[in-house]
C-alpha cells in the first residue's frame, strides 16, 4: 500500500515527524533535487523513523545485480529490495546517520548490530562505506571490515582480493578480501544454509558458513 503525499520527505524520520506513524512504503525525495524514490519505512521498531535500505527474507529477488542496479536500487520495497547506493550516499552526506542491521537465523534467534555513525562515499569513490561506534548483539567486532571498503558488484570489482569477491560470493557488497560479511549473498533455504561460502553471511554472529534467514539494514538520523 503506497503512502504518497504532497509533502516532500528526505527520509522516513521526516515522514514519521510529519505524523505518518504507520509502517509502509513512502515516497522520498533525493536531497537537493526533485528525484523521487520509494522506500519502506519502519515506524515501530526502536521508536520508528527507520528508512529500510536493504531487506532479505525469502529469496524472491536476485541480488546478483550490476553496478547500475545497486546504484539506483532494485526489488520491491514491500519485500526483498536494495534501496540504492546513490540515494543512501546523498542522504548520509547531508547529516549524521546511524545504521542498524537486524538479523534472523533459522533457529528462531535474532540479533542486531548498531553503528552510531554511518555514511557512504560518492560514486566517484565507489560508495565506500564508513562506520563507527558498534554496539549490539551480533558480535562485538564489526562484520563489515573497517575502515570501510569500496562497494563491488559482478561488473564493478573494487575489492582487495586478486579474486573477484562479488562473482565468487555473489551479490554487491563492501568486500575486503573477501571479508567477514555479505548480506547480499545467495539465499539458501533451511537445512541447506550451512557450509555455504556464498550465502548471507555475518561472521561475528554465526560464523563463516552459515547463511541467514532474514536481514534488514535500516538508517535513521542520529539526532532523531
Amino acid at each position: 500500500d503506497y503512502k504518497d503525499d504532497d509533502d516532500k520527505f528526505r527520509d522516513c524520520a521526516e515522514v514519521f515527524k510529519s505524523g505518518h506513524t504507520t509502517n509502509g512504503i513512502y515516497t522520498l525525495t533525493f536531497p537537493n533535487s526533485t528525484e523521487e524514490i520509494k522506500a519502506y519505512c519502519d515506524m515501530e521498531a526502536g521508536g520508528g523513523g527507520w528508512t529500510i535500505i536493504q531487506r532479505r527474507e525469502d529469496g524472491s529477488v536476485d541480488f546478483q545485480r550490476t553496478w547500475k542496479e545497486y546504484k539506483v536500487g532494485f526489488g520491491n520495497p514491500s519485500g526483498e529490495y536494495w534501496l540504492g547506493n546513490e540515494f543512501v550516499s546523498q542522504l548520509t552526506n547531508q547529516q549524521r546517520y546511524v545504521l542498524k542491521i537486524h538479523l534472523k537465523d533459522w533457529e528462531g534467534n535474532e540479533a542486531y548490530s548498531l553503528y552510531e555513525h554511518f555514511y557512504l562515499s560518492s560514486e566517484e569513490l565507489n560508495y565506500r562505506i564508513h562506520l563507527k561506534g558498534l554496539t549490539g548483539t551480533a558480535g562485538k567486532i564489526s562484520s563489515i571490515s573497517q575502515p570501510g571498503n569500496d562497494f563491488s558488484t559482478k561488473d564493478g570489482d573494487n575489492d582487495k582480493c586478486i579474486c573477484k569477491c562479488s562473482q565468487m560470493l555473489t551479490g554487491g557488497w563492501w568486500f575486503d578480501a573477501c571479508g567477514p560479511s555479505n548480506l547480499n549473498g545467495m539465499y539458501y533455504p533451511q537445512r541447506q544454509n550451512t557450509n555455504k561460502a556464498n550465502g548471507i553471511k555475518w561472521y561475528y554472529w554465526k560464523g563463516s558458513g552459515y547463511s541467514l534467514k532474514a536481514t534488514t539494514m535500516m538508517i535513521r538520523p542520529a539526532d532523531f
Epitope: N93, H117, Y119, S121, R128, K132, G133, T135, K140, P147
Partner: antibody, heavy 121, light 107 residues
C-alpha cells in the same frame, strides 16, 4: 600518494593569533575524510585540536573551542588553523593529518611533517 | 573526555626481545583504539587501528589487542629501527585523546 605540508610563522607573540596552513596533495579535501590539526607539546604530549570534514563541517576540542577556527580553501586544496589569544603554553609542534572517517573523530593515517611554533615576546 | 593511561613510560630492551605496552581507558572505548609510532624527528605513523588491525605495510611483528578499557600493543621481536615513542589513541568519543607515550630505547 597523499601528502600534507604545514606552513606558517615559527614565532608568535602572546595575545596574538596563530595562523597555520596545511597544503594537501594527492587527494581532494572535498572528496572524503576529515582533515585534522594536532599539536605536540614539549615533553611529547599529543593533543587533538579539531577537524574540518570533506563536507565542510567542523569539530573542535572543547578545551579550545572559544579560541579555535578551522577553515579551508577548496580551490587550493588547503585547510587552515587559527588559534586566538595565544600564550606561551601554546608553544608546540603543530601537525595536520587526515583521519579515516569523514563525519567523526578517527585514527589518522596521513600526517604532515609538523611545524614548530614558539609563543614568546 | 576519555583519559588514556599508558604504561610504562620507558622501556629499555635488547634487540630480539618481546615488548608489551598497555593502555587503560577511563571508560569504555569499544575497539576504537589506534597505536602510533613516532621516530626521532618524525611525525607519528599509524601502526594499528580498531585495536587489532595492522595498517597497510606495517610488519607483522607489531600487534594490538583489547576491547573496552584495556588495550595492549606488542612487538614480538624488537629490532634496532623500532627505537621510537609509541602512543595509543582512543577515537570512540570526541575529543579523541592520546596516551602519554612509551619511549622504547635499545640497550
Amino acid at each position: 600518494d597523499v601528502q600534507l605540508q604545514e606552513s606558517g610563522p615559527g614565532l608568535v607573540k602572546p595575545s596574538q593569533s596563530l595562523s597555520l596552513t596545511c597544503t594537501v596533495t594527492g587527494y581532494s579535501i572535498t572528496s572524503d575524510y576529515a582533515w585534522n590539526w594536532i599539536r605536540q607539546f614539549p615533553g611529547n604530549k599529543l593533543e587533538w585540536m579539531g577537524y574540518i570534514s570533506y563536507s565542510g563541517s567542523t569539530s573542535y576540542n572543547p578545551s579550545l573551542k572559544s579560541r579555535i577556527s578551522i577553515t579551508r580553501d577548496t580551490s587550493k586544496n588547503q585547510f587552515f588553523l587559527q588559534l586566538n589569544s595565544v600564550t606561551p603554553e601554546d608553544t608546540a609542534t603543530y601537525y595536520c593529518a587526515r583521519s579515516t572517517f569523514g563525519h567523526y573523530v578517527s585514527s589518522m593515517d596521513y600526517w604532515g611533517q609538523g611545524t614548530s611554533v614558539t609563543v614568546s615576546s | 573526555s576519555i583519559v588514556m593511561t599508558q604504561t610504562p613510560k620507558l622501556l629499555l630492551v635488547s634487540a630480539g626481545d618481546r615488548v608489551t605496552i598497555t593502555c587503560k581507558a577511563s571508560q569504555s572505548a569499544s575497539n576504537d583504539v589506534a597505536w602510533y609510532q613516532q621516530k626521532p624527528g618524525q611525525s607519528p605513523k599509524l601502526l594499528i587501528y580498531y585495536a587489532s588491525n595492522r595498517y597497510t605495510g606495517v610488519p607483522d611483528r607489531f600487534t594490538g589487542s583489547g576491547y573496552g578499557t584495556d588495550f595492549t600493543f606488542a612487538i614480538s621481536t624488537v629490532q634496532a629501527e623500532d627505537l621510537a615513542i609509541y602512543f595509543c589513541q582512543q577515537d570512540y568519543s570526541s575529543p579523541p585523546t592520546f596516551g602519554g607515550g612509551t619511549k622504547l630505547e635499545i640497550k
